[in-house]
Interface confidence: low
């Protein structure tokens, strides 16, 4: 008789794939445009990335550092109207993309929470949650919560409002903190909160250190659902050496939890990489005409258009990973086990019941290495086979689908491998 299938866990929509942050509507759409109506035209692109949610804004009226001139219920006319927003919600819904609204109050100002008027701001947030939930948004984000006095109790209250409306609504909080104790204390009082932080960016970017960061985080947060990113709002390129970008994409998509990216992460967009570009909001490089004032500043391989046509590009890797993440049970909600491997490597397995299993091997080092996989650390339920099929490599030159002998596995410098193997009873 076949063994009984393991009961599937309850899956919320944000468990099923990545979130995509667009913090600056104008920079995302490029020079000379940047409103909600224009964003509607980019939803097909977001669909092609297979992201499950769009974290948008802030979009509300905010005069720098002026509480009286900050209205969380009103969309800043520069971004469009409430009608434009409603249309965007409808269009996103048709494409199965959820919309999360950033309500960080003083986003144009010095202290994002108007430090001297916390209580009146908190009341405004409460009213705004109810207003925008009625309008049909799927969740909210608030950032810089380390600057919000009594953050835990406010977050608990806001989560109650959000979840009270529907269990299918999400609250995301962002912090600049990379301190695990601070992060855990914020999470303790909020059972379903998704927290983005700088935790992973406070790293020496070695395999050993990354492994210990990930395992400490998972141990400290218990069995709650995590999110993975390198910061609450920034681009991956601002925190990572260029040669590790692909490796981190593979890792973020295959760790247990929700990967969270910022617009441009999928093409390796850099803050202030181009002449004449403001540092704080790099313009999304859709094609070579993204910088009309500076001929030749943008080459095809930096753009969405150029990378879409190149199967070896970062964008193609992102799409492949996002696709795997959204359809494979073991990556969606599988168990996670790390095990010993060569110096500079971080290796782990994702598995769920009798579904296909995935092995991830990441070489953070700048030398080629034997994987040296030591399965003795693994529980019996997650043992390693002798061979596994290559799903993808972060480097060119390997044939996808080819079987690799795990005992003889060698990795190139900064190479990450995603391998699959079947469950064997």
């Amino acid at each position: 008789r076949a063994p009984r299938c393991r009961e599937l866990p309850a899956q919320k929509w944000w468990h099923t794939g990545a979130l995509y942050r667009i913090g600056d509507l104008q920079a995302f759409q490029g020079h000379g445009s940047g409103n909600l109506a224009g964003l509607k035209g980019r939803l097909d692109y977001l669909s092609s990335l297979k992201v499950k949610g769009l974290v948008l804004g802030p979009l509300h009226k905010n005069q720098k550092d002026d509480v009286a001139q900050t209205d969380l219920l009103q969309i800043d006319p520069n971004f469009g109207s409430k009608e434009d927003f409603d249309n965007l919600l409808q269009s996103a819904k048709k494409k199965s993309i959820r919309v999360i609204l950033d309500l960080t109050p003083n986003y144009r100002g010095e202290n994002l929470w108007f430090s001297t008027q916390v209580d009146s701001v908190a009341t405004k947030v409460k009213d705004a949650l109810e207003f925008w939930l009625q309008a049909g948004v799927d969740g909210f984000q608030v950032r810089d919560i380390e600057n919000l006095k009594d953050a835990s109790s406010f977050l608990a209250e806001w989560e109650n409002i959000t979840k009270g409306f529907s269990e299918d609504r999400l609250l995301i909080a962002g912090t600049n903190s990379s301190d695990l104790q601070q992060i855990v204390s914020l999470l303790e009082s909020n059972k379903d909160l998704l927290l983005t932080s700088s935790y992973l960016s406070d790293s020496s970017f070695t395999g050993e250190h990354t492994k210990s960061l990930v395992t400490q985080y998972l141990n400290a947060t218990g069995n709650r659902w995590c999110s993975w990113s390198l910061s609450q709002a920034g681009l991956l390129t601002s925190f990572l050496p260029a040669q590790l970008l692909r490796l981190y994409q593979l890792m973020l998509f295959t760790l247990p939890g929700t990967p969270v990216f910022s617009y441009g992460d999928e093409i390796g967009l850099k803050a202030a990489a181009l002449p004449g570009q403001p540092v704080e909001a790099p313009v999304m490089l859709w094609d070579e005409s993204s910088f009309p004032d500076i001929p030749g500043a943008v080459s095809a391989n930096m753009t969405v258009k150029g990378q879409s046509e190149d199967p070896g590009s970062l964008l193609s890797l992102f799409r492949q990973l996002s696709d795997q993440r959204s359809k494979e049970r073991s990556l969606l909600h599988g168990d996670f086990h790390t095990f010993s491997s060569g110096p500079g490597l971080f290796s782990y397995i994702r598995h769920w019941d009798q579904n296909e299993r995935f092995l991830v091997v990441l070489n953070f080092g700048d030398v080629g290495l034997s994987a040296g996989l030591q399965a003795s650390d693994l529980p019996a339920s997650a043992s390693l086979p002798t061979k596994a099929d290559l799903v993808l490599s972060t480097q060119p030159g390997r044939e996808e689908g080819s079987p690799l002998e795990l005992e003889r596995l060698k990795l190139e410098p900064h190479e990450g491998l995603l391998l699959r193997f079947p469950y064997v009873a």
């Epitope: 913090g23 600056d24 104008q26 920079a27 490029g30 020079h31 000379g32 445009s33 940047g34 520069n78 986003y107 144009r108 100002g109 010095e110 994002l112 950032r143 810089d144 380390e146 600057n147 600049n176 903190s177 990379s178 700088s198 960016s201 406070d202 390198l230 910061s231 609450q232 709002a233 920034g234 681009l235 601002s238 925190f239 803050a271 202030a272 181009l274 002449p275 004449g276 570009q277 403001p278 540092v279 704080e280 909001a281 313009v283 004032d293």
Partner: antibody
Framework: QVQLVQSGAEVKKPGASVKVSCKAS????????MHWVRQAPGQGLEWMGL????????SYAQKFQGRVTMTRDTSTSTVYMELSSLRSEDTAVYYC??????????????????WGQGTLVTVSS | DIVMTQSPDSLAVSLGERATINCKSS????????????LAWYQQKPGQPPKLLIY???TRESGVPDRFSGSGSGTDFTLTFSSLQAEDVAVYYC?????????FGPGTKVDIK
Amino acid sequence: QVQLVQSGAEVKKPGASVKVSCKASGYTFTSYYMHWVRQAPGQGLEWMGLINPSGGSTSYAQKFQGRVTMTRDTSTSTVYMELSSLRSEDTAVYYCARAGYCRSTTSCFNWFDPWGQGTLVTVSS
Amino acid sequence: DIVMTQSPDSLAVSLGERATINCKSSQSVLYNSNNKNYLAWYQQKPGQPPKLLIYWASTRESGVPDRFSGSGSGTDFTLTFSSLQAEDVAVYYCQQYYSTPFTFGPGTKVDIK
């Protein structure tokens, strides 16, 4: 209130290195870029580079590339600027200055406020 | 790199008189997407670090007297003193923060006539 306090004056020989510190207080250290600007005697202001204290990433002016290193210590809220292979024309007052305001750790508007009190570095044989 | 130039190099004005300093950038520092000019003005007195007066080309920093005002867009900017005071004697610099490397004008020395 927001304050930047720099280390004291230094006298160095040509070819040597100097490391200037800048201790920040009164705000969340990792939330703002820190810049270094220098001013030779009787001259104007020259931007040297910036460090993002959150991740430690840096951006240097081409002129100083290869000679300057900016680092930070988040436990003491201090940034450091080290300039190597010193020559007499590096004699200047070196200032640290915080980015005017930041919406996130990678989203800063880079006017400079406040400034440190300045550190005079004299390079002389 | 964006090159900043200032004129005049120096000027002497009577107390209470109006004065203007000009600043020009070699390329536009107006960012179309948010319609903001990425330009700041600073005041520096002898032996002191520079002090921020104006950012976004025309927004006065809090605590800065309203006799200081900034204007202009694109590549041409002006710092205006509506009524010069003795404590305004200093060197004034403009700075672009549109793109790296961030650059300053050479400075304008303001004295009392």
